[in-house]
Interface confidence: low
């Protein structure tokens, strides 16, 4: 039988009574075209809904949008257009919303031809009122919040201006002109670049890449010959174009572009790129692409300083530029990541990683599962998981793989059974471990979203026909039941639920469909009285993570320490509750080599945890440019892995000199830049 | 209550064999890891021996290494440690004791009362 | 291997007082697997401390155990008469699996 419906399975009792009770439904008053949403604040309810319909008329386009709010999480809708002069809202630009619970909205509208400038609504009272400010520029793109201060707003324009408000969008200044790319950092710091000759596509390897810390009174040039920029975690990254020849090299600085490094990477052609997979403020996850369209390419991870980098992964899923990888951070268990790498035989087979890029494996196969139509060998097989590249082939594949930092070991993705992904309709998969183990969840595909940090799973099947059915599941995924939430069928778009997975509120989008007219209609259920109760202590187990052979005493050492969770038991239906936070204890753990990545000039082997050097530097001097001085690298081949806790066990030595050498590898040396004030 | 009972400590010529047995109650034997710890007349406590729950794997103090012994059986709750090749050295009180749950180490929690090791010709 | 040291080899002091004793190792130990024990004549020893800070089931709060790296210090914040015994710090290493200090008797002044 299908998982969850066989006798094992306890029903939730009189669910039916309880969710209709708790199932509101609203229709829009409006002709179907889009819609998005977005989540004022956070635990607010508040929820802001655009839809627009556009009219192709013979010399133009008609526009016409309808702004509505809710303060109930999706129960309630109140159309509040008027609050924004029945004005025609941009979509491209989306709903600006500002940082943590500022309650600060932005909406750009459309304004006609000849004006000389654009046009934003802004609210700073979670859209209870917008105040409407005419632009001293057209905007190219959304308005950007500082992460530090929601009042301090930058955009670029269509001629490629700077522009910097500091008082939430009220007045702007353009602080820079010729600007190709800006990005909030930390402390209120703008890093943006600039062309100097023709226009950003043609300057591309020749721009510069400039710091303003004041909004723009004073700037500082911090590297030359850029071709692109990227922030990530506390690493400021810029791809060079080398002296000689097309080639370009990754540089790195930890502070804010005073000095750099150039990273330990690969340099890559013209048409090759790089890109930042993930980045916190211990490592980053690099991807390089191989030479030619090969699709793919290679995984480095880098040390503490985003300097020297390890080789994590080969035949790396990326295609071209700004194209599809599956790589995905799983949130719900620390270290843990899942990607996608293209085999010889041009097969697509999914990895996962427990140990941060450490080691990658194949996922295991389900208990439940049989090996399909791409195995050799039908009893030995892996899971093989569908994400980006997947849905961007259009497979029949909703969603991507989904975990929350909240619901402890909870990951759940779409998938086969065999030595590769497979294009046949693929079935749902859930691991409650962190993706050391998986089980079939449902038959087939659906949209799932996770609802009370884990307490709640709710699940749509994946249909053309309209539908009026959810499934749901209050325990992690086993057992599943089903509610009928309108007689009407509809055609389902989508599921929203509160970022975060705190909320017990989902909400159902789509249209209905009559001979003559289509309308938007939701319909938002509570799961509140399914769990009547609050969990208390009892409802709560001790479980180890990492957890992979309980006789040893390292047992769920990852990165040099362990975590033992309380997590719901699957057999208790109660509310973990919106203030629920995950409780966790860690115990360090004894160093062993797999604390420690192989250093500049080593590698490790397969299949062995010893660091060996690499045989083309056997007997040379380990020399490496560090902030401009050459520096001299004495070593047994191994660094402590960025964010890795271990004491004691194990302890390789390790030296660096400064060899009193400049080196500037033709980037610009600290005492190169120049800074000039407005 | 949980509990640990020592026995068969006595008196043995040095070259000599014994076979020390450990009951344990009211805990799941198999989930814990067991040991053998003894301490010499007037002196410290020092290590002997480690096996894991399932008797998969098993450790030895250097000073024991191939001529002790340890196991288990999990049917019957039982600790054993067969002592061969004895030395004077090797007279102690040896305690059997509780080791970590599972996934953590949280000391040797649970002690017996001890067995009497006497190695003399 | 790591050698505990622990110091004094004997701490004189009235019932009331505060009693620091210390265990050193010779090299680093993780906090998690160090343990505190109390050992009284003819009776088996006792589990205080584990993971170098954490009160194991039943044991009073005058007893607290604090330290990571190489130093580790049990504190009895004033002293009863029943806690005149000999303590002995603990670790769990790669080599031998455990190891011992050589123990600190705690006796009345």
């Known amino acids: 039988s299908a998982p969850g419906e066989d006798e094992e399975c306890g029903r939730v009792r009189d669910f039916v009574a309880k969710l209709a009770n708790n199932t509101h439904q609203h229709v829009f008053d409006d002709l179907r075209g889009s819609v998005s949403l977005s989540w004022v604040g956070d635990s607010t309810g508040v929820i802001l809904v655009l839809t627009t319909f556009h009219v192709p008329l013979v010399i133009m386009t008609f526009g016409q949008s309808k702004l509505y709010r809710s303060e109930d999480y999706g129960k309630n809708f109140k159309d509040i257009t008027d609050l924004i002069n029945n004005t025609f809202i941009r979509t491209e630009f989306g709903m600006a919303i500002g940082p943590e619970n500022s309650g600060k909205v932005v909406l750009t509208a459309e304004v006609s031809g000849g004006s000389r400038g654009g046009r934003i609504f802004r609210s700073s009272d979670f859209a209870k009122n917008f105040v409407q400010t005419d632009l001293p520029f057209h905007p190219l793109t959304q308005m950007m919040y500082s992460p530090q201060n929601s009042d301090y707003l930058l955009a670029l324009s269509t001629e490629n201006g700077l522009w910097v408000s500091k008082n939430f969008g009220g007045k702007w200044e353009e602080i820079h002109k010729a600007v190709c790319l800006a990005k909030w950092g930390s402390d209120n710091t703008i890093f943006f670049t600039t062309y100097a000759n023709g226009s950003c596509k043609a300057d591309l390897g020749a721009l510069e890449l400039w710091r303003t810390s004041d909004l723009g009174k004073s700037f500082k040039t911090i590297g030359v010959k850029i071709y692109s920029f990227g922030l990530g975690g506390r690493f400021l990254f810029a791809s060079v174009m080398a002296d000689k020849d097309t080639t370009r090299r990754i540089h790195v600085s930890t502070d804010q572009g005073d000095t750099w490094s150039m990273a330990q990477l690969p340099s890559v052609g013209q048409e090759q790129f790089y890109s930042i997979l993930a980045a916190n403020d211990d490592m980053v996850f690099m991807h390089v692409d191989e030479p030619g369209d090969t699709g793919f390419g290679t995984i480095f991870t880098s040390d503490d300083r985003g300097i020297v980098y390890s080789k994590s992964l080969d035949r790396h899923l990326y295609t071209t530029t700004g194209g599809e990888t599956d790589f995905t951070n799983v949130t719900s268990l620390r270290g843990v990541y899942i990607t996608s790498v293209l085999s010889e035989d041009n097969s697509i087979q999914t990895m996962i990683t427990f140990d941060q890029g450490g080691r990658w494996t194949h996922l295991r196969k389900p208990e439940n599962s049989e090996c399909d139509a791409t195995a050799k060998n039908k009893n030995e097989c892996s899971l093989h998981i569908h994400a980006s590249y997947s849905i961007s082939q259009k497979l029949n594949v909703p969603m991507a793989p989904l975990s929350e930092p909240n619901a402890v070991g909870i990951v759940i993705a779409h998938g086969s059974v065999g030595d590769a992904i497979s294009v046949m309709v693929p079935d749902v998969y859930i691991s409650d471990d962190g993706g050391y183990s998986w089980t079939k969840m449902l038959e087939g595909p659906h949209y799932y979203t996770i609802l009370d940090s884990g307490g709640i799973i709710v699940a749509i099947e994946h249909s053309s026909r309209p539908i009026n059915v959810i499934k749901f599941s209050t325990d992690e995924g086993q057992c599943w039941q089903t509610y009928t939430f309108t007689r009407d069928p509809i055609y389902f778009t989508g599921l929203a639920s509160e970022p975060g997975a705190r909320s017990m509120n989902i909400s159902i989008w789509g249209f209905t469909e009559s001979f003559l007219t289509s309308q938007w209609v939701s319909y938002t259920i509570d799961f509140k009285d399914i769990l009547e109760r609050n969990c208390e202590e009892k409802d709560y187990t001790i479980w180890l993570a990492h957890s992979t052979d309980p006789e040893d005493y390292e047992d769920g050492c990852i990165l040099g320490y362990k975590e033992q969770f309380l997590r719901l038991r699957k057999s208790s239906v109660c509310q973990n509750g919106r203030d629920y936070v995950v409780t966790k204890q860690p115990s360090i753990c004894l160093c062993s080599l797999e604390d420690f990545l192989c250093d500049f000039g080593y590698y490790r082997p397969e299949n062995d945890s010893k660091c060996v050097e690499q045989p083309e530097l056997k007997g040379h001097d380990l020399e490496f440019c560090l902030y401009g001085r050459e520096e001299h690298l004495t070593t047994n081949g191994y660094r402590k892995i960025p964010g890795d806790k271990c004491q004691g066990g194990v302890n390789p030595v390790r030296e660096v000199k400064d060899l009193k050498k400049k080196c500037t590898s033709n980037f610009l040396s600290p005492e190169k830049q120049n800074s000039k004030s407005n | 209550e949980v509990q640990l009972l020592e026995s068969g400590g006595g008196l043995v010529q040095p070259g000599g064999s014994l076979r020390l047995s450990c009951a344990a109650s009211g805990f799941t034997f198999s989930s814990y890891a067991m040991n053998w710890v003894r301490q010499a007349p007037g002196k410290g406590l020092e290590w002997v021996s480690a096996i894991s729950g399932s008797g998969g794997s098993t450790y030895y103090a250097d000073s024991v290494k191939g001529r002790f012994t340890i196991s288990r059986d999990n049917s019957k709750n039982t600790l054993y440690l067969q002592m061969s090749s004895l030395r004077a050295e090797d007279t102690a009180v040896y305690y059997c004791?509780?080791?970590?749950?599972?996934?953590?180490?949280?000391?040797?929690?649970?002690w017996g009362q001890g067995t009497t090791v006497t190695v003399s010709s | 291997e790591i050698v505990l040291t622990q110091s004094p080899g004997t701490l004189s002091l009235s019932p009331g007082e505060r009693a620091t004793l210390s265990c050193r190792a010779s090299?680093?130990?993780?906090?998690?697997?160090l343990a505190w024990y109390q050992q009284k004549p003819g009776q088996a020893p006792r589990l205080l401390i584990y993971g170098a800070s954490s009160r194991a089931t039943g044991i009073p709060d005058r007893f607290s155990g604090s330290g990571s790296g190489t130093d580790f210090t049990l504190t009895i914040s004033r002293l009863e008469p029943e806690d005149f015994a000999v303590y002995y710090c603990?670790?769990?290493?790669?080599?031998?699996?455990?190891?011992f200090g050589q123990g600190t008797k705690l006796e009345i002044k």
């Open positions: 090299q680093s130990v993780s906090s998690s697997y």
């Open positions: 004791t509780r080791g970590r749950g599972i996934g953590y180490y949280n000391g040797m929690d649970v």
């Open positions: 603990q670790q769990y290493g790669s080599s031998p699996m455990y190891t």
